[in-house]
């Protein structure tokens, strides 16, 4: 008799794939054309990335550091109208992309929470949640919550409003903190909050340290659903050495939880890499004409267009990973087990019941080496086979689909491998 299937966990939409942050509409769309109507034309691109949610904005009226001139219910006319926003919501819904609205109040100012008028701002946020929920948004983001006095109680209240409207709505909080205690205390009072932080970026970027950061985080947060990113708003390139970008994409997509990216992460966009760009919002490089001020400043391999045509590009890797993440049960909600491997490596297994299993081996070091996978660390339910099929490598040169002998597996410097193998009773 076949063994009984394990009962599937309840899956919310944000459990099924990545979230994509567009913090600056104008920078995302390119010079001078950034509005909601234009964003509608980029939804096909977001669909091609297989992201499940779009974290948008802030878009509301905000006169720098002026509470009275900050209206969370009004869209800044520079971005478009409420009608444009409604149209965007409808179009996104048709493409199964959820829209999360950033309501961080004083986004143009110094202190994002007008620190001297917290209570009046909190009231504004409450009203805005109800208003935008009625308008059809799928969730909210608030950032810099470490600067919000009594953050935990405010977040609990806002989460109640959000979930009270529908369990299918999401609240994301962002913090610059990388302190695990602080992060855990913010999470404790909010059962379904998704928290983005700088936790993973406080790293020496070695396999051993990353493994310890991830396992400590998972242990501290218990069995709650996590999100994975390197910051609450920034680009991966701002925190990572270039040679680890692909490795981190693979890791963020295969850890248990929701990966959260910023626009441009999929092409390795750099903050202020080009002259005159604001550090916090570099112009998205759609093609070589995206930066007309300086001819030749943008080469094809830096752009969406160029990378779309190159199967070995970072963008192609992102799409491949996003696709796997959104359809494979073991990656969607599978158990997670780390185990010992060679120096500089971080290796783990994702498995769910009798579904195909996944092995991830990440070499953070710049020395090629034997993987040295120590299967003895694993529970009986997650044992390693002698061979596994290569789903992808973060580097060119290996043949996808080829079987690799795990005992003789060798990794290149900075190489990450995603391997699959079947469940065997």
């Amino acid at each position: 008799r076949a063994p009984r299937c394990r009962e599937l966990p309840a899956q919310k939409w944000w459990h099924t794939g990545a979230l994509y942050r567009i913090g600056d509409l104008q920078a995302f769309q390119g010079h001078g054309s950034g509005n909601l109507a234009g964003l509608k034309g980029r939804l096909d691109y977001l669909s091609s990335l297989k992201v499940k949610g779009l974290v948008l904005g802030p878009l509301h009226k905000n006169q720098k550091d002026d509470v009275a001139q900050t209206d969370l219910l009004q869209i800044d006319p520079n971005f478009g109208s409420k009608e444009d926003f409604d149209n965007l919501l409808q179009s996104a819904k048709k493409k199964s992309i959820r829209v999360i609205l950033d309501l961080t109040p004083n986004y143009r100012g110094e202190n994002l929470w007008f620190s001297t008028q917290v209570d009046s701002v909190a009231t504004k946020v409450k009203d805005a949640l109800e208003f935008w929920l009625q308008a059809g948004v799928d969730g909210f983001q608030v950032r810099d919550i470490e600067n919000l006095k009594d953050a935990s109680s405010f977040l609990a209240e806002w989460e109640n409003i959000t979930k009270g409207f529908s369990e299918d709505r999401l609240l994301i909080a962002g913090t610059n903190s990388s302190d695990l205690q602080q992060i855990v205390s913010l999470l404790e009072s909010n059962k379904d909050l998704l928290l983005t932080s700088s936790y993973l970026s406080d790293s020496s970027f070695t396999g051993e340290h990353t493994k310890s950061l991830v396992t400590q985080y998972l242990n501290a947060t218990g069995n709650r659903w996590c999100s994975w990113s390197l910051s609450q708003a920034g680009l991966l390139t701002s925190f990572l050495p270039a040679q680890l970008l692909r490795l981190y994409q693979l890791m963020l997509f295969t850890l248990p939880g929701t990966p959260v990216f910023s626009y441009g992460d999929e092409i390795g966009l750099k903050a202020a890499a080009l002259p005159g760009q604001p550090v916090e919002a570099p112009v998205m490089l759609w093609d070589e004409s995206s930066f007309p001020d300086i001819p030749g400043a943008v080469s094809a391999n830096m752009t969406v267009k160029g990378q779309s045509e190159d199967p070995g590009s970072l963008l192609s890797l992102f799409r491949q990973l996003s696709d796997q993440r959104s359809k494979e049960r073991s990656l969607l909600h599978g158990d997670f087990h780390t185990f010992s491997s060679g120096p500089g490596l971080f290796s783990y297994i994702r498995h769910w019941d009798q579904n195909e299993r996944f092995l991830v081996v990440l070499n953070f070091g710049d020395v090629g080496l034997s993987a040295g996978l120590q299967a003895s660390d694993l529970p009986a339910s997650a044992s390693l086979p002698t061979k596994a099929d290569l789903v992808l490598s973060t580097q060119p040169g290996r043949e996808e689909g080829s079987p690799l002998e795990l005992e003789r597996l060798k990794l290149e410097p900075h190489e990450g491998l995603l391997l699959r193998f079947p469940y065997v009773a």
Epitope: Q243, L369, R398, E412, P413
Partner: antibody, heavy 120, light 111 residues
Framework: EVQLVESGGGLVQPGGSLRLSCVAS????????MHWVRQAPGKGLVWVSR????????RYADSVKGRFTISRDNAKNTLYLQMNSLRAEDTAVYYC?????????????WGQGALVTVSS | QSVLTQPPSVSGAPGQRVAISCTGN?????????VHWYQQLPGTAPQLLIY???DRPSGVPDRFSGSKSGTSASLAITGLQAEDEAAYYC???????????FGGGTKLTVL
Amino acid sequence: EVQLVESGGGLVQPGGSLRLSCVASGFTFSSYWMHWVRQAPGKGLVWVSRINSDGSIIRYADSVKGRFTISRDNAKNTLYLQMNSLRAEDTAVYYCVREGRYTGSSLDYWGQGALVTVSS
Amino acid sequence: QSVLTQPPSVSGAPGQRVAISCTGNNSNIGAGYDVHWYQQLPGTAPQLLIYGNSDRPSGVPDRFSGSKSGTSASLAITGLQAEDEAAYYCQSYDSSLTGWVFGGGTKLTVL
């Protein structure tokens, strides 16, 4: 057939400079990390320096740090070693070496070597 | 003084088996970094003989084998032949020196 051909060796006075070149053929040079390894007369092998495929990651042995510079020109399939402030103890045959792929960073192909003699 | 320690010389008669040891520490071989072996025939450049502790590149006879355990590694040559007379070097990576390290070399004499 993989080939690595060094040139630029010779006699130089202490404190002087020399630039070694290594022309690679028979493989996609731009896909491989490269090394320089030296061997003093009658002695063993000593690692000198390493450069990654696009030239963005570089390492040196402590004994040459600050004096030697490794670089590459992928368009010309050429690896370089610029040696300044040369000392008598730098006298050796210098090998240009390719690092293998999927071999645990072994050194899988070696040039024939270029002799550098530092003497007054 | 080399980071990895090898015997300066070994010898054996044709047809015999010889083994060359290579001893490191916990920042190189013992840390889990791979050990590679090179053969240098008189007057020529070194050639890769064993990579990744025990794998042979194509063209290397199966008389040559490598193994690794703890902080040391070993190269074994069976069915010794006159043309095996050469210097043999082990090599690994050292995390404290952040560089590639070699043994001092072992001169093999075929009697």
